[in-house]
């Protein structure tokens, strides 16, 4: 149900983070907000509260600004939105941008059962273990799949992959999370190799040149099937 009286607003801006929405504790991150050419002011909000203000530089592109977070910590991890003003009007909110801080406290162990090299169609399960008690575990595949899976668990979580296809091959890491925005150090990478069967070019392997410190993903959960939530994790890669 929508309320009858609606405020007149401008179209929503686009928000994204560079180099990534996952930032190692202590590292810097840029949050970009792109609105209209006529925008006179941009405001960044963190978890519903005003966080920072930027005015576009006349010498540069007028329709976007950069907000700089010099040191990412658990206190700056969370959801950011931005707004812009043009004349007397304010824009609608951007989509939420979730910034996660990694590199906290401990490093989990990741292993794969029955082994890292399996035949096509074999059942595979990843296990992630963290000695520090945590609430949730995340399994990420570098590049390629654009999926995160999460599982609740205290010290260990298992991620059943089912009968594997060539799409499953690639390099995986896991994290333990202390809350949705504060994650552990990443585990050592585990590369899953699939042998046998007929090569299918539509299921391309993971890009071997992918950078290990840059993650590109959508949020997925495998508690009741895989449900993509791409809008929430969209960090619109633009220059």
């Amino acid at each position: 149900q929508r309320i009858n009286t609606e405020k007149e607003t401008l179209p929503k801006p686009i928000i994204w983070a560079k180099p990534s929405i996952m930032v190692t504790n202590g590292n810097s991150v840029n949050i970009w907000c792109q609105g209209a050419q006529s925008a006179s002011e941009y405001q960044l909000y963190f978890e519903g509260s005003f966080f920072a203000l930027e005015r576009p530089k006349p010498s540069r592109s007028m329709n976007k600004v950069r907000f700089f977070i010099s040191q990412m910590t658990s206190h700056t991890a969370g959801i950011y939105t931005c707004f812009y003003q043009s004349g007397e009007l304010w824009s609608k909110s951007s989509n939420p941008l979730k910034l996660v801080v990694t590199g906290l406290y401990d490093t989990p162990n990741l292993w794969v059962y029955p082994r890292p090299e399996v035949t096509l169609g074999e059942n595979v399960t990843f296990f992630c273990q963290l000695k520090t008690a945590t609430s949730k575990f995340f399994l990420l595949k570098e590049r390629g799949s654009n999926h995160i899976q999460n599982k609740y668990g205290n010290i260990q979580a298992e991620f059943p992959m089912g009968p594997v296809t060539r799409a499953h091959r690639g390099t995986y890491r896991c994290f333990g999370s202390y809350n949705d925005y504060a994650w552990s150090f990443p585990s050592e990478p585990v590369t899953l190799l699939i042998t046998g069967g007929v090569e299918n070019s539509s299921l391309a392997p993971t890009d071997p040149t992918s950078s290990l410190d840059y993650w590109e993903f959508d949020l997925s959960t495998n508690e009741s099937g895989l449900q993509k939530d791409s809008a929430f994790w969209d960090h619109t890669t633009q220059n």
Epitope: I3, K7, E47, G48, G78, I79, T81, S93, Y181, A231
Partner: nanobody, 123 residues
Framework: DVQLQESGGGLVQAGGSLRLSCAAS????????MGWFRQAPGKEREFVAA????????FYTDSVKGRFTISRDNAKNLVYLRMNSLTVEDTALYYC????????????????WGQGTQVTVSS
């Protein structure tokens, strides 16, 4: 279709407590700030409390600070309003709202609204 359904209202004596719940469906719950508003007969709908996406920040109108507590469970798509030390002035229809407001207290900046649950405080 987005639906917000409030529950937990009722008749309570002054000084008593209630807990309101709001269940959201058809929306990615964690992508929205959730708010509670209220409307007494013959009065404007007014802001009561709001909670940020990840429950990092909470916001209250002055008259309920220290008495009301807003919380949310993103895993269950629920938002709650715990109301203690209720007074006759708290009698109203309580609405749950979802949005991405710049000013959390502005009812015009919330996109979705429930039908409301009645809270009546007797002296």
């Amino acid at each position: 279709d987005v639906q917000l359904q409030e529950s937990g209202g009722g008749l309570v004596q002054a000084g008593g407590s209630l807990r309101l719940s709001c269940a959201a469906s058809g929306v990615t719950f964690s992508q929205y700030i959730m708010g509670w508003f209220r409307q007494a007969p013959g009065k404007e709908r007014e802001f009561v409390a709001a909670i940020s996406y990840g429950a990092v920040n909470t916001f209250y109108t002055d008259s309920v600070k220290g008495r009301f507590t807003i919380s949310r469970d993103n895993a269950k798509n629920l938002v709650y309003l715990r109301m203690n030390s209720l007074t006759v002035e708290d009698t109203a229809l309580y609405y749950c709202a979802a949005g991405r407001p710049r000013q959390v207290s502005s009812k015009l900046e919330y996109d979705y609204w429930g039908q409301g649950t009645q809270v009546t405080v007797s002296s």
